[in-house]
């Protein structure tokens, strides 16, 4: 795929990191399964607030309550994990704030592993009432599939009761799980009915079964562990943005590029232009002009605003985002209509040039 020729010599590196990339490091709200979570939309002067989860509109239901600028999730489950956004619609503009929700009882790297919770799972029975093993907290066992970044700590729990007090043992892929089966071994905390593996690696992937038994019976529960090779990533651009737009001659228009990046993103807005009546240079590469880029003199580089547009402004606008790992690009088209035609949002057209992803 071909590259391009810049029309003017623009310094593309910012002298200092841009100051506003809220989406580059969304705030993370952590909840354990079964807990309630309340998040306030941190946007001011909102006439109307709408919510999305992983890009899909979020409406109220029996567990999700939306009141003013508050989102409440009752009895959180791992399925509630994801990238959330609240959008404040105002009379003149709109603004979006992103945050992550992580519902998990797996310990993440750096967390305190003293495991003070769970003591309530150790149930003492009246010595006369003989009873086969039973689960005391199935909510904590609801999440069977655990996808955990490599190097993190994993905790599987099987809170149980019974009389006499059952014993617990663990199997990996149906076979006895021995300390020597993994570098660093593992911890079993019988009082908390838990198995803890620190600094997981890809070879830890598999099915982990807790077997809880006493003389009156045996029960078991299986978790599947997937170890995700954690790695920093190049920028991710929100699908559908920037969106195609149309306006009349003399009108104003805005293109928005929403960026998710582990590392400082460098945003450029680029347009195909003509030079000496040609769209391509002698090397066959298209002429491009950098209209705006992030840096100390650029505010909110995620937005490209065009005012008092002319027919010459029509064409393709590219949002190109890079970080130290790599790049991502998405583009949109601006249609400029004669004054008598009313403008409208164009969502059908999706175009990206050959050399862009």
């Amino acid at each position: 795929r071909p590259s391009f020729s810049l029309v003017e010599d623009t310094t593309l590196e910012p002298e200092e990191p841009p100051t506003k990339y809220q989406i580059s490091q969304p705030e993370v709200y952590v909840a354990a399964p079964g807990e309630s979570l309340e998040v306030r939309c941190l946007l001011k002067d909102a006439a109307v607030i709408s919510w999305t989860k992983d890009g899909v509109h979020l409406g109220p239901n029996n567990r999700t309550v939306l009141i003013g600028e508050y989102l409440q999730i009752k009895g959180a489950t791992p399925r509630d994990s994801g990238l959330y956004a609240c959008t404040a619609s105002r009379t003149v503009d709109s603004e979006t704030w992103y945050f992550m929700v992580n519902v998990t009882d797996a310990i993440s790297s750096g967390d305190d592993e003293d495991d003070t919770d769970g003591a309530e799972d150790f149930v003492s029975e009246n010595s006369n009432n003989k009873r086969a093993p039973y689960w005391t907290n199935t909510e904590k066992m609801e999440k069977r599939l655990h996808a955990v970044p490599a190097a993190n700590t994993v905790k599987f729990r099987c809170p149980a009761g019974g009389n006499p007090m059952p014993t617990m043992r663990w199997l990996k892929n149906g076979k006895e799980f021995k300390q020597e089966h993994r570098i660093g071994g593992y911890k079993v905390r019988n009082q908390h009915w838990s198995l803890i593996m620190e600094s997981v690696v890809p070879s830890d992937k598999g099915n982990y079964t807790c077997v809880v038994e006493n003389e009156y019976g045996s029960i078991n529960h299986t978790y599947h562990l997937d170890v995700v090779e954690r790695s920093p990533h190049r920028p991710i651009l929100q699908a559908g943005l920037p969106a195609n737009a149309s306006t009349v001659v003399g009108g104003d228009v805005e293109f928005v590029c929403k960026v998710y990046s582990d590392a400082q993103p460098h945003i450029q807005w680029i347009k195909h232009v003509e030079k000496n009546g040609s769209k391509y240079g002698p090397d066959g590469l298209p002429y491009l002009k950098v209209l705006k880029h992030s840096g100390i003199n650029s505010s909110n580089a995620e937005v490209l605003a065009l005012f008092n547009v002319t027919e010459a402004d029509a064409g393709e606008y590219i949002c190109k985002v890079s970080n130290y790992i790599g790049q991502a690009n998405q583009s949109a088209w601006l249609t400029v209509l004669p004054k008598q035609q009313a403008p409208g949002r164009e969502k059908e057209i999706t175009a990206s040039p050959d050399y862009l992803e």
Epitope: G110, P232, A263, N323, Y324
Partner: antibody, heavy 114, light 107 residues
Framework: QVQLVQSGAEVKKPGSSVKVSCKAS????????VHWVRQAPGQGLEWIGS????????SYNQNYKGRATITADKSTSTAYMELSSLRSEDTAVYYC???????WGQGTLVTVSS | DIQMTQSPSSLSASVGDRVTITCKAS??????IAWYQQKPGKAPKLLIY???YRYSGVPSRFSGSGSGTDFTFTISSLQPEDIATYYC?????????FGQGTKLEIK
């Protein structure tokens, strides 16, 4: 698995040029920057520059601008770093690294000596 | 350009010790800091990225923290195989500069 394999050691005269290659495998070459880093004997690490092979975008440390040229050949998944006007203080091990700095080449020793 | 000042330049510690290395950026770099381990004759190895994320397969005794201009790298319990030189690097803006390194030795 991901691998970056660099060309062999070079001995060069002052004033000449050297071109070091870095062949990538095990990942999508066009989806990551390739960085070049050098380390003089007994010294620390210094970033020279990088290229995004998909479109050829490159970025350089100003200390090397004009002397270093970084290119990439998508057809062979190979990145190159050429350093011109060599002087004795360019004697160093030159490393290529994938964009996330998680994978590095084995290093190429370039010795500049008259 | 952003300068990375790493300290100490060398340190000696015993097996089992807690070891801490600091890195100071001349300008704010948010959390765009990585830490590497380099053994003689070998390429650097990524340990920590984005200030506090351990890279895949890196033992849990290695950790990182900090934001803005001040960063810390910690080995919670030094092992014999940890003897190496450690580097910090900012990957916020080009040129992606490294600290001058900390050589870690066993007492």
């Amino acid at each position: 698995q991901v691998q970056l394999v660099q060309s062999g050691a070079e001995v060069k005269k002052p004033g000449s040029s050297v071109k070091v290659s870095c062949k990538a495998s095990g990942y999508i070459f066009t989806s990551y920057n390739v960085h070049w880093v050098r380390q003089a004997p007994g010294q620390g690490l210094e970033w020279i520059g990088s290229i995004y092979p998909d479109n050829g975008d490159s970025s350089y440390n100003q200390n090397y601008k004009g002397r270093a040229t970084i290119t990439a050949d998508k057809s062979t998944s190979t990145a190159y770093m050429e350093l011109s006007s060599l002087r004795s203080e360019d004697t160093a091990v030159y490393y290529c690294a994938r964009g996330d700095f998680a994978y590095w080449g084995q290093g190429t020793l370039v010795t500049v000596s008259s | 350009d952003i300068q990375m000042t790493q300290s100490p330049s060398s340190l000696s510690a015993s097996v089992g010790d807690r070891v801490t290395i600091t890195c100071k950026a001349s300008n704010g770099v948010s959390n765009d800091i990585a830490w590497y381990q380099q053994k003689p004759g070998k390429a650097p190895k990524l340990l920590i990225y984005s200030a506090s994320y351990r890279y895949s397969g890196v033992p849990s005794r290695f950790s990182g923290s900090g934001s803005g201009t001040d960063f810390t790298f910690t080995i919670s319990s030094l092992q014999p195989e940890d003897i190496a030189t450690y580097y910090c690097q900012q990957h916020s803006t080009t040129p992606y500069s490294f600290g001058q390194g900390t050589k870690l030795e066993i007492k």
